[in-house]
Every structure is written in structure tokens, then in C-alpha cells.
Interface confidence: low
Amino acid sequence: MEDEKPKVNPKLYMCVCEGLSCGNEDHCEGQQCFSSLSINDGFHVYQKGCFQVYEQGKMTCKTPPSPGQAVECCQGDWCNRNITAQLPTKGKSFPGTQNFHLE
């Protein structure tokens, strides 16, 4: 289990939290922050928050944007403050690269 953790870990970051899952809080602590955009019943739903454990965000953060959902992840205090996830536009290709920073 200990071998699974990143080299610099478990540094907790302060992340901006926006969306229903945040309750009354405007921040959360986690090993990764994220900013996401999804389409739900035709509406754009923006969310920001954190993954408590690195493994939680591992697959989500690696997933390339699709027409219905985009997630950008980062590591650093408040690093998701100015990140706004964007859905891919028609004709634009998105390579499946990781969007978060690992030391």
C-alpha cells in the first residue's frame, strides 16, 4: 500500500470547492484539486473540489475530455481557483494527456 503513494505525499492541498457536493463549504482539502464541466439535461454543470486520496482521482484525471464531460486536475494550494474545464469543440482533437502536475 505504501508503495502506491506518490513520492511527495500525502501533502494535502487546499482546493476551491463549488457545487452541490460542497455543502456550505467553499474549500476542501485533498491530494488533488479538480475543476469539471459536464452536461446534464442540456445544462452546463460546473464543479470544483478535491480528491481526498490520490488514487480517487487517478482515472478521472487521466480521462480525456469528451463531448459530455471534461475534468482538469492539479496539485497545489488553491490551484483550481482559476481553472475552468472546457468541453472539446467540433473538429478539435484532444490527446489523452494528464492535466495534473506531479512532482
Epitope: V8, P10, K11, E25, Q52, C74, G76, E103
Partner: antibody
Framework: EVQLVESGGGLVQPGRSLRLSCAAS????????MHWVRQAPGKGLEWVSV????????DYADSVKGRFTISRDNAKNSLFLQMNSLRPEDTALYYC????????????WGQGTLVTVSS | DIVMTQSPDSLAVSLGERATINCKSS????????????LAWYQQKPGQPPKLLIY???TRESGVPDRFSGSGSGTDFTLTISSLQAEDVAVYYC?????????FGGGTKVEIK
């Protein structure tokens, strides 16, 4: 006013166990990661363990790994350190410390509780 | 583990004079993505717990007198007391919070000459 009050220290024989408690008040306890830091008599500071606000992330110094267990009860605003298989080198003043909201440094400390491991 | 080395071990300074404490980390504590140095300074007076003075290497904690200042980046850091007061007699510690295990310097004892 933020207050952290440790208890549970005392004289214990090598190999025995002890459970430290830290009662927190004056801040929203379940918003913050909490740490234990110790200080051997006349020596410097040594970080012991951390627990995140929701207990999802826990880590220990190598010197106590496998022997000490950190836990918390957010409903009771309490932090704990279960110390098993105690050694003479564990003799120290044990502080509980509140993590600052911006990083893993400590903006509030308790007064400490003294643990003496001796036969 | 990141090893923190403080110098000198002790320091005797006249009242009103400048006191300078050095702290060196065995590897950089500068986090490139946010340009922050993950380093804090504490003051510990006899019989008391440590008190936070400085974080992010140079940000003074609220309520800390402005005669205390922190500087440095990467691996080399300095805590300066610009004009030593009697109440500044204490042991000062640096701490890195870049990675676990969190580690402290050995401490520098500041006394009045």
C-alpha cells in the same frame, strides 16, 4: 479562542501502551488536519503523525510506524494517539498541533503531555 | 527524508542588535507549480509550546512583530530579528512542509549578550 489540551501522558514501562488525547475547541475541528509532534527532554521537535480532517489521509514518522495509531472523533472534537510497544526513546513531551489552512505547518499547539518510558 | 540543518546552534546578541539564523534543507522545498517555499519558522520559549512566526519562508503570521522577517528560496533560508528585544530570548526552529515526514531543524538558541 483556539485551545488544544492534551492528556493521557504518564510513566509507563517499555513494551506497554498508552493512549493520548487532545481536546480541541475554538475552531471548526472537522475542517482541519491535525498532527502530533513530540519533543524529547532538552531536544528538538520531531513530527510524529498526521490525520486529515476526514481521516482519509494518515501518515507516520518511520520511528513510530507500526506502533502508533492516530485517530480522531470529529463529533467530540478530539484527537487521539494510541501508542503501543513503547520504547525508552519515545520519552518526550507530546504536542497536538492544528494544521494551518494553507499548508502543513502549525498555527496552534497544545501545552503538551509528558510520556516517560522507563523500567 | 529532507534534512533541515540550522546554524548556528546558539547565538548571543546585544539588545537592539540584529540576530540572523540560517536554515538549510537537503533538497529544495520550492514547489514550482505555485512558486511557494514550503518552509516555516517557530519560536519556542522555555516551558512553552512553539509559536508560529513565519510561513511560506517569508510571510509573517498575524500578530508577529515586524522585527521578525524570513527570506530565502530553494534550499537556503534565513530568519532575521532586526532589533533584538529581551522577550525574543528563545529557541528558534525551521520546518519544511514540502513532504512527509515533516522535518524540523535542530534549533538555534538566541540569548542576550
Amino acid at each position: 479562542e483556539v485551545q488544544l489540551v492534551e492528556s493521557g501522558g504518564g510513566l509507563v514501562q517499555p513494551g506497554r501502551s498508552l493512549r493520548l488525547s487532545c481536546a480541541a475547541s475554538g475552531f471548526t475541528f472537522d475542517d482541519y488536519g491535525m498532527h502530533w509532534v513530540r519533543q524529547a527532554p532538552g531536544k528538538g521537535l520531531e513530527w510524529v503523525s498526521v490525520i486529515s480532517w476526514n481521516s482519509a489521509t494518515i501518515d507516520y514518522a518511520d520511528s513510530v510506524k507500526g506502533r502508533f495509531t492516530i485517530s480522531r472523533d470529529n463529533a467530540k472534537n478530539s484527537l487521539f494517539l494510541q501508542m503501543n510497544s513503547l520504547r525508552p526513546e519515545d520519552t518526550a513531551l507530546y504536542y497536538c498541533a492544528k494544521k494551518n489552512s494553507l499548508g502543513w505547518f502549525f498555527d496552534y499547539w497544545g501545552q503538551g503531555t509528558l510520556v516517560t518510558v522507563s523500567s | 527524508d529532507i534534512v533541515m540543518t540550522q546554524s548556528p546552534d546558539s547565538l548571543a546578541v546585544s539588545l537592539g542588535e540584529r540576530a540572523t539564523i540560517n536554515c538549510k534543507s537537503s533538497q529544495s522545498v520550492l514547489y514550482s507549480s505555485n512558486d511557494n517555499n514550503y518552509l516555516a519558522w517557530y519560536q519556542q520559549k522555555p516551558g512553552q509550546p512553539p509559536k508560529l512566526l513565519i510561513y511560506w519562508a517569508s510571510t509573517r503570521e498575524s500578530g508577529v512583530p515586524d522585527r521578525f522577517s524570513g527570506s530565502g528560496s530553494g534550499t537556503d533560508f534565513t530568519l532575521t530579528i532586526s532589533s533584538l528585544q529581551a522577550e525574543d530570548v528563545a529557541v528558534y526552529y525551521c520546518q519544511q512542509y514540502y513532504s512527509t515526514p515533516l522535518t524540523f531543524g535542530g534549533g538555534t538558541k538566541v540569548e542576550i549578550k
